[in-house]
Amino acid sequence: APVPPGEDSKDVAAPHRQPLTSSERIDKQIRYILDGISALRKETCNKSNMCESSKEALAENNLNLPKMAEKDGCFQSGFNEETCLVKIITGLLEFEVYLEYLQNRFESSEEQARAVQMSTKVLIQFLQKKAKNLDAITTPDPTTNASLLTKLQAQNQWLQDMTTHLILRSFKEFLQSSLRALRQM
């Protein structure tokens, strides 16, 4: 199983090292999740030809996956630390149902899928400690999530493959934009 950040042998062998700051821990956690996504994408791309499909073709889907927009304050123009942090946390909370869907979608990378899901939960906790305005963060409705999950799991095989690919790609892009913004904070 993948080793969570901070628990690899290098860390054990270097007890004299300075403990990670909150920002460094978040940075490391996101890179760890990105590594996990990369492994999952490899399996997905080996299994189907979804990865060759053009972005335009894939855009025609009914998934409401979180995406960074100018108004979210995470890009250089209109950068706003607090607005951006709220968007990152809200987006990660919205991704959780899609990460649940990914469980059981992988044969050789089942543990990796679980690691991505659990590491994201930890990341959300790290970020919530960093946020000042927790009231602005809206948590997805569990009933809505449950029915969405049921609907996604009822799709035919081709659509399930497409959904898996889109979730991984969108989650990767969201994390990349999030980390780029967090590195400015």
Partner: nanobody, 124 residues
Framework: QVQLVESGGGLVQAGGSLRLSCTTS????????MAWFRQAPGKDREFVAD????????WYADSVKGRFTISRDNAKNTILLQMNSLKPEDTAVYYC?????????????????WGQGAQVTVSS
């Protein structure tokens, strides 16, 4: 890691323009965040600009904003830095850098591959 090769440096008068180019032969170029840094004699390496893998997330240092433009052509495995209204203080060795996580950022430690650098000299 990817091999990065910069070109397009040279000597130019203040107010002039130059275009730097950075090319790689790496197959996975499109998944990297790419950046330009610069280093003047006796100074630390300084962030200039970076660009995400989809060209939709671009950041500039305040000192170059409005004068420099970073862009990428994934089909040609190339990133460009168009430098206009050059000033003597832009004189430095310009380095191309790549981040395999596709994130980027303003610190050199975020990048795992570096080019050899291209000298840019702006005379007054």
């Amino acid at each position: 890691q990817v091999q990065l090769v910069e070109s397009g440096g040279g000597l130019v008068q203040a107010g002039g323009s130059l275009r730097l180019s950075c090319t790689t032969s790496g197959r996975t170029f499109s998944s990297y965040a790419m950046a330009w840094f610069r280093q003047a004699p006796g100074k630390d390496r300084e962030f200039v600009a970076d660009i995400g893998e989809n060209s939709d997330n671009i950041w500039y240092a305040d000192s170059v904003k409005g004068r420099f433009t970073i862009s990428r052509d994934n089909a040609k495995n190339t990133i460009l830095l168009q430098m206009n209204s050059l000033k003597p203080e832009d004189t430095a060795v310009y380095y191309c850098a790549a981040d395999s996580y596709g994130v980027g950022g303003g610190k050199p430690e975020y990048y795992d591959s570096w080019g050899q650098g291209a000298q840019v000299t702006v005379s007054s």
